[in-house]
């Protein structure tokens, strides 16, 4: 029970995760311009990945996309590349760990697929969620960069009659959803990673065996005191797993790791 | 088409205090942001306050202690409610439309004079 | 507060030539998001409410005529009436569109010589 609860809660936070992610990369607001010590403006600038937009007091807003692909920053390319593989490697592992839930029955799906499915799509969150930390670290270490440049040479102007006050931006709201969804991403891999050993049999050299007293269909087990009626299913040698939780629905009852003789 | 009619202005003590309005027609208030402007006999223009159409308001900060910019979107009818009145607040007092776009007054109403005197 | 600094104070032309006013402001009205001059030019004739002009710095309203045309960016800002005529006696403001409060600048008054 356990194990299927914390694959389902990986699977849930991951999903907030990456629609954080996705958001964060079409929001407008990834820098806005920074207004402190400065006149109180008509016009309020901010800028997203893919557009910067002019919102006026009025209402009217302006938004206009950089339609230029060789023309722009490095770093905000790179910023772009880190979000587009964040959500990519997040959208795959989403449908990987979809199959991948133990609670949804897809055939005769081993669980030790599903196992090996829950880790991919945990290893996938985990990068997803890097990509995306990494993607707004790179865009506010670059903010800062250029926030303490243009302090620096705030107010440049004709013998200090005339300012020309440069635009200095600050962090918008993208960033900080991204860092959550990156973050959120993240936790949800680590937990689907956490979920996977839960789910991962055991593989041994020794096999269970039953013993049979004469007379009697029963088979001894010196472990765990527990007795079931021989030749049944369960006395097939079978995969042993470790005490993970169970499904309410097994009825099979499974050699414990104590039970080897 | 778009109007704007200002009314209230008259002659009033040093120390009171007045209402002017501005009826709307042609637009909605909650569409357009609408400005005061004064402006002294023989002298320029000076803009007073504005309300957008959102609702938010600025002012001139010297006369934001003393004048209130409101308006009544059911009515379509804009304020500028004036207190502690002063001799040198004597003028024609304007409203204007924000044309929406780049910020400047599209459509003014024709003035009404404020004269403060004892 | 920005100040609007407008020259000359009065202009005579005769009709037909151009007339040139000028405006000046303490701060930059461009605005790098959307390299647009928050700036505005009215003309005021006597006993009569301000008519927009120019906005943008640069482009004309709607019914005004072409003769009339708005140049500059950031500090530095030009009204051109091309070929003066009798009806353009007036006086003419700049007006700061960018930061509150929206000043005006001080006028400058057009007279045919």
């Known amino acids: 029970m356990a194990v299927t609860a914390c694959q389902g809660l990986g699977f849930v936070v991951s999903l907030i995760g990456i629609a954080g992610i996705i958001a964060a990369t079409c929001m407008d607001q990834w820098s806005t311009q920074d207004l402190y010590n400065n006149p109180v403006t008509a016009v309020f600038n901010y800028q997203g990945l893919w557009r910067s937009c002019v919102r006026e007091s009025s209402g009217f807003t302006e938004c206009r996309g950089y339609f230029t692909l060789l023309g722009l920053p490095a770093m905000l390319q790179a910023v772009r590349a880190l979000m587009i593989v964040g959500i990519v490697l997040g959208a795959i592992g989403l449908l990987v760990s979809i199959f991948a839930l133990k609670c949804i029955r897809i055939g005769s799906m081993e669980d030790s697929a599903k196992a090996n499915m829950t880790l991919t799509s945990g290893i996938m969150f985990i990068v997803s969620g890097l990509c995306a930390i990494a993607g707004v670290s790179v865009f506010a270490n670059m903010l800062v960069t250029n926030f303490w440049m243009s302090t620096a040479n705030m107010y440049t102007g004709m013998g200090g009659m005339v300012q020309t006050v440069q635009t200095r931006y600050t962090f918008g709201a993208a960033l900080f959803v991204g860092w959550v969804a990156g973050g959120l991403t993240l936790i949800g891999g680590v937990m689907m990673c956490i979920a996977c050993r839960g789910l991962a049999p055991e593989e041994t050299n020794y096999k269970a065996v039953s013993y049979h007293a004469s007379g009697h269909s029963v088979a001894y087990k010196p472990g765990g005191f527990k007795a079931s009626t021989g030749f049944g299913s369960n006395t097939k040698n079978k995969k042993i797993y470790d005490g993970g939780a169970r499904t309410e629905d097994e009825v099979q009852s499974y050699p414990s790791k104590h039970d080897y003789v | 088409q778009v109007q704007l009619v200002e009314s209230g202005g008259g002659v009033v003590q040093p120390g009171r205090s007045l209402r002017l309005s501005c009826a709307a027609s042609g637009f909605t208030l909650t569409s357009y942001g609408v400005y005061w402007v004064r402006q002294a006999p023989g002298k320029g223009l000076e803009w007073v306050a504005v309300v957008w159409a959102g609702g938010n308001t600025n002012y001139n900060s010297a006369l934001m202690s003393r004048f209130t910019i409101s308006k009544d979107n059911s009515k379509s009818t804009l304020y500028l409610q004036m207190n502690s009145l002063r001799a040198e607040d004597t003028a024609v007092y304007y409203c204007a439309r924000d044309r929406g776009r780049l910020l400047a007054m599209d459509y003014w109403g024709q003035g009404t004079l404020v004269t403060v005197s004892s | 507060d920005i100040v609007m600094t407008q020259s000359p104070d009065s202009l005579a032309v005769s009709l037909g030539e151009r007339a040139t006013i000028n405006c000046k402001s303490s701060?930059?009205?461009?605005?790098?998001?959307?390299?647009?001059?928050?700036l505005a030019w009215y003309q005021q004739k006597p006993g009569q409410p301000p008519k927009l002009l120019i906005y943008?710095?640069?482009t004309r309203e709607s019914g005004v005529p072409d003769r009339f045309t708005g140049s500059g960016s950031g500090t530095d800002f030009t009204l051109t009436i091309s070929s003066l005529q009798a009806e353009d006696v007036a006086v003419y403001y700049c007006q700061n569109d960018h930061f509150f409060p929206f000043t005006f600048g001080q006028g400058t008054k057009v007279e045919i010589k």
């Open positions: 701060q930059s009205l461009l605005n790098s998001g959307n390299q647009k001059n928050y």
């Open positions: 943008g710095a640069s």
